[in-house]
């Protein structure tokens, strides 16, 4: 999906008001310096591409993020404010169903959510030069 035509300001507002709080809740008890950010993005569409991938695609050691509250609200934001996004999602999650269970907070998942927080922060500051 090409995120170029999303309403970035509305997605940013939803992130700041709600999604960010759910990410913090997920990470509670973890030091903010515990993980190094290794995933980056260069502009808002690219950031959303990376955010979608990290949130919804199972990875080795962390298959459960797509069932978390922040993931549901992320999907809702993308579906509402990215034209045609929901049409690209046909059965996208159905193949993962059996592998996804909530409440398995592994260290790998915490690291992945830490990366997500970094991507969202970058999404919110689109005019900053890439480090």
């Amino acid at each position: 999906y090409d995120f170029t035509n999303c309403d970035f300001e509305k997605i940013k507002a939803a992130y700041l008001s709600t999604i960010s709080k759910d990410l913090i809740t997920y990470m509670s008890g973890t030091k903010s310096t515990e993980f190094n950010n290794t995933v980056s993005c260069s502009n808002r569409p690219h950031c959303l591409t990376e955010i979608q991938s990290l949130t919804f695609n199972p990875t080795a050691g962390c298959a459960s993020l797509a069932k978390e509250m922040f993931a549901m609200k992320t999907k809702a934001a993308l579906a509402i404010w990215c034209p045609g996004y929901s049409e690209t999602q046909i059965n996208a999650t159905q193949a993962m169903k059996k592998r996804r269970k909530r409440k398995v907070t592994t260290n790998k998942c915490l690291e992945q959510v830490s990366q997500l927080q970094g991507l969202w922060r970058r999404f919110n500051r689109p005019l900053l030069k890439q480090q």
Epitope: S17, T18, M72, Q89, Q94
Partner: antibody, heavy 121, light 108 residues
Framework: QVQLVQSGAEVKKPGSSVKVSCKAS????????VNWVRQAPGQGLEWIGQ????????DYAQKFQGRATLTADKSTSTAYMELSSLRSEDTAVYFC??????????????WGQGTTVTVSS | DIQLTQSPSFLSASVGDRVTITCSVS???????LHWYQQKPGKAPKPWIY???NLASGVPSRFSGSGSGTEYTLTISSLQPEDAATYYC?????????FGQGTKLEIK
Amino acid sequence: QVQLVQSGAEVKKPGSSVKVSCKASGYTFSSYWVNWVRQAPGQGLEWIGQIYPGDGDTDYAQKFQGRATLTADKSTSTAYMELSSLRSEDTAVYFCARGTYYNNYYGTDYWGQGTTVTVSS
Amino acid sequence: DIQLTQSPSFLSASVGDRVTITCSVSSSISSSNLHWYQQKPGKAPKPWIYGTSNLASGVPSRFSGSGSGTEYTLTISSLQPEDAATYYCQQWSSYPLTFGQGTKLEIK
């Protein structure tokens, strides 16, 4: 304008199943989660689960896992809630409600009018 | 599961009174995830307050909400006859989504 119109009242026997429909109009059906909530007579509200019509993704309250099935038909913009192995305690009004961002806060905005399901032998 | 406990469960007050309903949450949640609904007999619940303190469209300004962590309140500054209803708090912080048991507000 946004509307959620639910199917009519049902009377069912214990052990049978019921399927309640919720027809959406006035918005892009596939882009919004649909929640299902029930209310037993004189009681409070109880969340059953939710479905994202875009890809059929679902979440259920553990209490209803395996007994409730949420589906959605994008061609008719209709969400369904099927409850099996009915017992008298399932007698309730069942509501569908659209999940959305309201002033950047995520919650439900539009609700169906409710469907009364009575389970009686 | 996160439990929400409302107090009181029943409240009778006079027109013009200041009324406060409390919602206690079993574990701390973000204020952005606490909402209030109003329900009248035979009707579907109506969103009333989002994110602790943001009034839904059409809700009179005599209503307000506040709180953080585990304690939240809905306040009516000057009770009107049309405010007679049952009010529910709800959390969107973690699954399963849960509601308070409701506070039935009656006009004396």
